[in-house]
Interface confidence: medium
């Protein structure tokens, strides 16, 4: 008769994570008689997977009755298979000894594959809240997946970016990988609606791609253009100067008044006005006695925006025309200073 | 046995550019990868970059990204590191040294190339 | 980019005394660290891969341990051939990054 051979028909075997993997062994007879173990890897330091004569294996299950006198196949199951299952499991013939059983045969070993899903995409942004024409960076993670092929795109309102590095790790062989990208991206004023998208292809996706995505509202910040202007009198001895603040996210803005360098009142945007590209407005005004002033008087409209150091706008009213006269046929100009270079306004009101 | 041997010194004046070989022997050549791995004199080790030297993958460091080239040729068993545009700060000795394919260890290590880079 | 940080920096020894080396990552790389040797002139040369496997070759002395972020190599019983700098090199992810050397001095 023939000497035992050890069949290991499956050279390797793909199985996605969760699922049970089947691999194949069978005799090609009965005899020596002696049982059957699997392992995973070779040599001194191979991982008993199975053993038929003992122990427990929770997570094995022969597929055929392993205690029949004329059973051959010697076929397992694993189940809730993970990336750490990944190997060489060999199929090893033992012949019936004293006092312990010895390794006969083995089988040539079936490669174990796992495909593993990449976790959700993870998108975060800089710490810090940065200004049109800046550039932030966003990173994207994800995680555990396998085999180490996969593709990572950014996109930013749905146009493509093309200014990343990413990076898949380890570098060497593992069970299951890493993806780490950082995707640089140039702000713009128009930017509080965007989205920044991190966009992750595997085969395990089955085409369907896993999206993570980061609103560009949590990383801008749009600083605002202040305009002062005078308005028609109201009394006889009161004039109403009005700050318009214009355009700024996010809405933490705190605007103070001076008159002549001092402290006359401050508040904090409340009833704001929402632009179409998602910048708020917001006005404030000022009623000035003006019988109470001798000389002309220097109206400063400061605005500190979401804890930034303040922009301001100045107006010089003036009172030595008769107050009637204010808004009609003298001229009162706005003498705009704003420190950040947003342009100067010269109002004259007819 | 297994044989790194790197090209001779060379001395390059400021923006001209340098090439280092490395011949490879006593082991299948397409096996591994090769690094490249520079040690300006008096500091520490930095690495430069990797080819497979199967399928010719290539991974930069970014610090030297647009600057250095490195390429194989298989049937001479021979790796290739070119770096351009040459200022004096890139004067030190360059190594070539073998790459495990799964731990990215470097296990052999050729003697290194003295790269003088002065005006 | 992963920074690795060694330390110290030098340190005198005598023949016989165990010496320990640490090597700290600045994210987990499993055990993909790697240890070397190099001495004035010469190529750096490998003791320890995959964080405590040791090289063929390299006397057993040589003992290398750590997973994740903390790592540690220890030579006991110092001989006056391993008077050397000493790196670790993180291959975890690129780019490939190494320690900034431990100069081992006799005392």
């Known amino acids: 008769e023939e000497e035992l051979q050890v069949i290991q028909p499956d050279k390797s075997v793909l199985v996605a994570a969760g699922e049970t993997a089947t691999l194949r062994c069978t005799a090609t007879s009965l005899i020596p008689v002696g049982p059957i173990q699997w392992f995973r890897g070779a040599g001194p330091g191979r991982e008993l997977i199975y053993n038929q004569k003992e122990g427990h294996f929770p997570r094995v299950t022969t597929v055929s009755d392993l205690t029949k006198r004329n059973n051959m196949d010697f076929s397992i199951r694993i189940g809730n298979i993970t990336p750490a299952d990944a190997g060489t499991y060999y199929c090893v013939k033992f012949r019936k000894g004293s006092p312990d059983d010895v390794e006969f045969k083995s089988g040539a070993g079936t490669e174990l594959s796992v495909r593993a899903k990449p976790s959700a995409p993870v998108v975060s942004g800089p710490a810090a809240r940065a200004t049109p024409q800046h550039t932030v960076s966003f990173t994207c993670e994800s995680h555990g997946f396998s085999p180490r092929d996969i593709t990572l795109k950014w996109f930013k309102n749905g146009n493509e970016l093309s200014d990343f590095q990413t990076n898949v790790d380890p570098v060497g062989e593992s069970v299951s990988y890493s993806i780490h990208s950082t995707a640089k991206v140039v702000l713009t004023r128009e930017d509080v609606h965007s989205q920044v998208i991190c966009e992750v292809a595997h085969v395990t996706l089955q085409g369907d791609p896993l999206r993570g995505t980061a609103n560009l509202s949590e990383t801008i910040r749009v600083p605002p253009t202040l305009e002062v202007t005078q308005q028609p009198v109201r009394a006889e001895n009161q004039v109403n100067v009005t700050c318009q603040v214009r355009k700024f996210y996010p809405q933490r803005l705190q605007l103070t008044w001076l008159e002549n360098g001092n402290v006359s009142r401050t508040e904090t945007a409340s009833t704001v006005t929402e632009n179409k590209d998602g910048t708020y407005n917001w006005m404030s005004w000022l009623l000035v006695n003006v019988s109470a002033h001798r000389d002309d008087v220097k109206l400063t409209c400061q605005v500190e925006h979401d804890g930034q150091p303040a922009v301001s706008k100045s107006h010089d009213l003036k009172v030595s025309a008769h107050p009637k006269e204010q808004g009609s046929n003298t001229a009162a100009e706005n003498t705009g200073s704003n420190e950040r270079h947003h342009h100067h306004h010269h109002h004259h009101h007819h | 046995q297994v044989q790194l041997v790197q090209s001779g010194a060379e001395v390059k004046k400021p923006g001209a550019s340098v090439k280092v070989s490395c011949k490879a022997s006593g082991y299948t050549f397409t096996s591994n990868a090769m690094h490249w791995v520079r040690q300006v004199p008096g500091q520490g080790l930095e690495w430069m970059g990797w080819?497979?030297?199967?399928?010719?993958?290539?991974k930069y460091s970014q610090k030297f990204q647009g600057r250095v080239t490195i390429t194989r040729d298989t049937s001479a068993t021979t790796a290739y590191m070119e770096l351009s545009s040459l200022r004096s700060e890139d004067t030190a000795v360059y190594y070539c040294a073998r790459g495990d394919y799964y731990y990215y260890y470097m296990d052999v290590w050729g003697k290194g190339t003295t790269v003088t880079v002065s005006s | 980019d992963i920074q690795v940080t060694q330390s110290p920096s030098s340190l005198s020894a005598s023949v016989g005394d165990r010496v320990t080396i640490t090597c700290r990552a600045s994210?987990?790389?499993?055990?993909?660290l790697n240890w070397y040797q190099q001495k004035p002139g010469k190529a750096p040369k490998l003791l320890i891969h995959a964080a405590s496997s040791l090289q063929a070759g390299v006397p057993s002395r040589f003992s290398g341990s750590g997973s994740g972020t903390d790592f540690s190599l220890t030579i006991n019983s110092l001989q006056p051939e391993d008077f050397a700098t000493y790196y670790c090199?993180?291959?975890?992810?690129?780019?490939?990054?190494f320690g900034g050397g431990t100069k081992v001095e006799i005392k």
């Open positions: 080819i497979k030297a199967g399928n010719a993958e290539i």
């Open positions: 994210q987990s790389i499993s055990d993909f």
């Open positions: 090199q993180q291959s975890y992810s690129t780019p490939l990054s």
